[in-house]
């Protein structure tokens, strides 16, 4: 096992948003790993009368490209590609607020569940933006 | 905006001990997997251990049974405790999580 590298994705969790693309990994094991996780992170949510449609119809997809970013083709050495902070920012303070703020005070959904912080994002105009990951938000196009 | 802080470089003679620490801004459990890389002079950088979120860990064939990564929730905070120090550990140490890197903290092994 050495640093990260890319493979297509095998879940189920997320497949109909990543299919079977390429997607960077920290190690070997790690995508049955967080596959695993997802999973039941999905089943509580499922569950959840938390959350409400607008933010359910992009929460789920980001939190897939968090959890198995695609790899960064543009890159030499393996490298993840990041979410887009506009559309970040959109989901956390606009569509999904709600429902941030009640994952983010539940211990029991962050222990399954990680939520991206908009901060860790490259500022949009930057060039380490020029290449994230972009969910289709309305609002951020 | 830096978003992890290393702390806890030195000097240090063989034999020794240092403890690294990592401090997150924000939640350090937002990341699936966070590390320890190190680079020594003239070399390319190397992962050294890693920790994923369900508590997994890797360390490098060099450091295993010397150095133990470990993670502290509660404090945002990611540590390495360096047992048994050589010279060949002599290298800036950093934090990674994601494509986010701290600045890095200088080990230094030397009698």
């Known amino acids: 096992e050495e640093d990260g590298f890319c493979q297509p994705y095998r879940g189920i969790a997320c497949a109909r948003f990543i299919g079977n693309r390429t997607v960077y990994m920290e190690s070997l094991h790690m995508q049955g790993e967080i596959e695993n996780q997802i999973t039941a992170a999905f089943t509580m949510i499922g569950t959840s009368s938390h959350l409400s449609d607008k933010c359910s119809q992009f929460a789920i997809p980001s939190l897939c490209h968090y959890a198995f970013p695609y790899c960064d083709e543009t890159s030499s050495v393996p490298k993840p590609r990041d979410l887009c902070r506009d559309e970040c920012e959109i989901l956390e303070n606009v569509l999904c607020q709600t429902e941030y703020i009640f994952a983010r005070s539940n211990p029991m959904i962050l222990m399954r569940l990680k939520l991206p912080n908009c901060e860790d994002l490259p500022q949009p105009e930057s060039p380490e933006a020029a290449n994230c990951i972009r969910i289709g938000i309305p609002m951020a196009d | 905006e830096v978003q992890l802080v290393e702390s806890g470089g030195g000097l240090v003679q063989p034999g020794g001990s240092l403890r690294l620490s990592c401090a997150a801004s924000?939640?350090?459990?937002?990341?699936?997997?966070v590390g320890w890389y190190r680079q020594a002079p003239g070399k390319q950088r190397e992962l050294v251990a890693r920790?994923?979120?369900?508590?997994?860990?890797y360390y490098a064939d060099s450091v295993k049974g010397r150095f133990t990564i470990s993670i502290d929730n509660s404090k945002n905070t990611l540590y390495l405790q360096m047992n048994s120090l050589r010279a060949e550990d002599t290298a800036v140490y950093y934090c990674n999580a994601r494509n986010l890197w701290g600045q890095g903290t200088l080990v230094t092994v030397s009698s």
């Open positions: 924000g939640s350090i459990s937002r990341f699936y997997a």
């Open positions: 920790i994923s979120s369900g508590g997994s860990t």
